[in-house]
Interface confidence: low
């Protein structure tokens, strides 16, 4: 009777029984698998060829029979050594061994490239017992082979703590070439040489590589894989692919685009994010980078005033984050702003120019030529000054702020006055006699209060001491001008 079981981890019983006489070295399987005429779904390799002694591991049993005859060595019978087949075909191969019935527990396991094959593999073990020995055939089948099934398969049997190993069965799965390295998309400088690499493997070998550029073959003769294509240079974008040929046919790689680096397109959508009196925050959308990373950008600023000298201020910045604060601008001024960016090839054209204005700011300078004098008859202090220069007013003047500090023995008091924009003089009442009055003036716009002028001091005597000499803003450089009366 034939016993058939799926390969599992448990040992198979080997039908103990007497074993007089010599070992039977060949068995005809009790189960045959005929193929339909003209159609062979899988390769079937019969393992039970009698042959020369096995060269692999051999277990020499020490057990003897009643007559004390030593048992012959246990070894797997020879089988096919090398199976070549196409991808997706089926294959079945096996190993066989005749084991004396004296051995109770044996297991046959399949190994591939040094690792045991466990789990859902189609491994079947068949037993053919007779009086003295049991022939065991372990079959391994793969219904649709893949490249990953390539390798060296062996059977192992453990018996009496000995391990018997079969000769390897090499499975070689042949198919269309398989790419291990395909060309990569690149951005290259015009008329500059570059390399593309293509590598494909079988089996079967050899694999020959043909290069294709824009659907036309490049090389008249193919090269053995791997192939490096040196392109002497391009003047326009091209698509490259490679064809890998072997005896099974042709595989075509992905097409890769080789772009020619060019100067970038100009930035677009330059916009004003924020304006102050002396700065403008702008942003822009970068144009196409010309297949080469942006390195930096240049912001060009020119006064929009037709009477200006037309000079352009240039501010360089990094390409990111597409944002720049233009500083050191004049308040209440109109500017034209353009942006240009560069890559390794060169500068883009300038973006469309946009108009931007700074806001009003506080004046940047104080009123000039401040003069203070005492008008004793009216018990007033007269203050005179000159407007700051128009360009430095940073806005439309709305007036002036006057600070006057009165200091006398142990007493100090500061008063602030606001005066209208049209005047250039003011009169304040004497607050304290026999005291020093310190006066400072600042210009005021809607943007705020500008810096105060340097302090000017005047002594206000007790009643009856007359002096008409004025105090005034000193020449620059004197830190604490005091006019001694």
């Amino acid at each position: 009777a034939i016993t058939e079981a799926r390969e599992e981890a448990k040992p198979y019983p080997l039908f103990p029984g007497p074993f007089p006489g010599s070992l039977q070295t060949d068995h005809t399987p009790l189960l045959s698998l005929p193929h339909a005429s003209g159609y062979q779904p899988a390769l079937m390799f019969s393992p039970t060829q009698p042959g020369r002694p096995h060269t692999g591991n051999v277990a020499i049993p020490q057990v003897t029979s009643v007559e004390s005859k030593p048992l012959p060595p246990l070894a797997f019978k020879h089988t096919v050594g090398h199976i070549i087949l196409s991808e997706h075909k089926g294959v079945k191969f096996n190993c066989s061994i005749s084991v004396p019935n004296i051995y109770q527990d044996t297991t046959i396991s399949w190994w591939k490239d040094g690792k045991e094959l466990l789990g859902a593999h189609h491994a079947i073990t068949q037993f053919y017992p007779d009086d003295e020995v049991t022939a065991i055939i372990a079959s391994f089948s793969i219904t649709s082979v893949q490249r990953s099934d390539n390798g060296s398969y062996i059977c192992k049997m453990k018996i009496n703590n000995e391990e018997i190993v079969s000769d390897p069965i090499y499975i070689e799965v042949q198919g269309l070439p398989h790419f291990t390295k395909q060309p990569e998309s690149m951005n290259v400088t015009r008329n500059t040489a570059f390399n593309l690499t293509c590598q494909a493997v079988g089996p079967p070998e050899p694999v020959n590589i043909f290069w294709v550029q824009n659907s036309s073959r490049v090389n008249e003769q193919p090269e053995k894989s791997p192939s490096v294509l040196t392109v002497p240079g391009l003047t326009e974008m091209a698509v490259f692919s490679c064809e890998a040929h072997n005896d099974k046919g042709l595989t075509v790689s992905k097409g890769v685009q080789i772009n020619i680096k060019a100067i970038p397109s100009p930035p677009t959508e330059v916009s004003i994010r924020n304006s102050t009196a002396h700065s403008i925050l702008i942003s822009w959308v970068p144009g196409f980078d010309g297949y080469s990373p942006f390195r930096n950008c240049s912001i060009q600023v020119k006064e929009a005033d037709p009477l200006s000298n037309g000079s352009v201020m240039i501010f360089n910045t990094s390409a990111l984050p597409h944002l720049y604060q233009i500083k050191q601008l004049q308040a209440l001024a109109n500017y034209s702003i353009g942006v240009s960016c560069m890559n390794e090839i060169g500068w883009s054209a300038v973006s469309p120019w946009i108009l931007a204005s700074t806001t009003e700011g506080a004046p940047s300078v104080a009123p000039l030529n401040v003069t203070v004098f005492l008008n004793e008859s009216s018990d007033n202090v007269d203050i005179r000054w000159m407007k700051p220069p128009t360009k430095q007013q940073d806005g439309e003047l709305v007036g002036y702020r006057i600070s006057h500090v009165w200091q006398s023995a142990g007493i100090s008091k500061e008063l602030l006055e606001e005066v209208g924009q049209n005047g250039s003089r003011a009169r304040i009442s004497v607050q304290v006699h026999n005291a020093t009055c310190t006066v400072r003036i600042a210009a005021v716009t809607r943007g705020g209060v500008g810096p105060f002028s340097d302090p000017v001091k005047i002594f206000i005597p007790a009643h009856g001491w007359v002096d008409y000499a004025p105090s005034s803003t000193p020449a620059p450089g004197n830190a604490d001008p005091v006019l001694i009366i």
Epitope: F210, S215, P222, D247
Partner: antibody
Framework: QVQLVQSGAEVKKPGASVKVSCKAS????????INWVRQAPGQGLEWMGW????????KYNEKFKGRVTMTTDTSTSTAYMELRSLRSDDTAVYYC?????????????WGQGTTVTVSS | EIVLTQSPDFQSVTPKEKVTITCSAS???????FHWYQQKPDQSPKLLIK???NLASGVPSRFSGSGSGTDFTLTINSLEAEDAATYYC?????????FGQGTKLEIK
Amino acid sequence: QVQLVQSGAEVKKPGASVKVSCKASGYTFTTYDINWVRQAPGQGLEWMGWIYPRDGYTKYNEKFKGRVTMTTDTSTSTAYMELRSLRSDDTAVYYCARGYYDNLYYFDYWGQGTTVTVSS
Amino acid sequence: EIVLTQSPDFQSVTPKEKVTITCSASSIISSNYFHWYQQKPDQSPKLLIKRTSNLASGVPSRFSGSGSGTDFTLTINSLEAEDAATYYCQQGRSVPLTFGQGTKLEIK
């Protein structure tokens, strides 16, 4: 199986043109070159050029440049070779042959040949 | 262009004899680029040996090829009557692709 079937014999006058066809079957037409090789009576084989049907890429023997044009019709898997300004020494059997580039270049299948006779 | 010169141009041989045809190239050719064809009377040429020594499909094992560099050889080990034909060598190394002038083999 791979087959290359050529058009029938032609008789032409000097100065005329001839167009020979070669219909391929049994393989993917666009994957292999079609070469044209001629053989004058009692002479050896002379390569004229090839065409790659997938993109129409051609390579001609300098000797025939300007007189020969190779084309294909992929819809019918047919290759054509036109030779112009015929002379009497163009009398030959013209073969189409499939080019196999492992390694370049051999001809693994041949048509049966088309005899072209140039005579006044 | 690469010129291929075959020797001899003609050979008359009796069956079972061994025949050697040589082909000399004007430039060095890698063995992968060298091929042989057989052309029987009134037939198309047929690929006989590719890449110097690899028999084409269906070619009897009595045919063999060898050589390297500039000198290549076609050998027929035990000639049979059906081997009467003209044999051509061919290089695939550079364009224009070229053939030898041919060696005509006659069976006595």
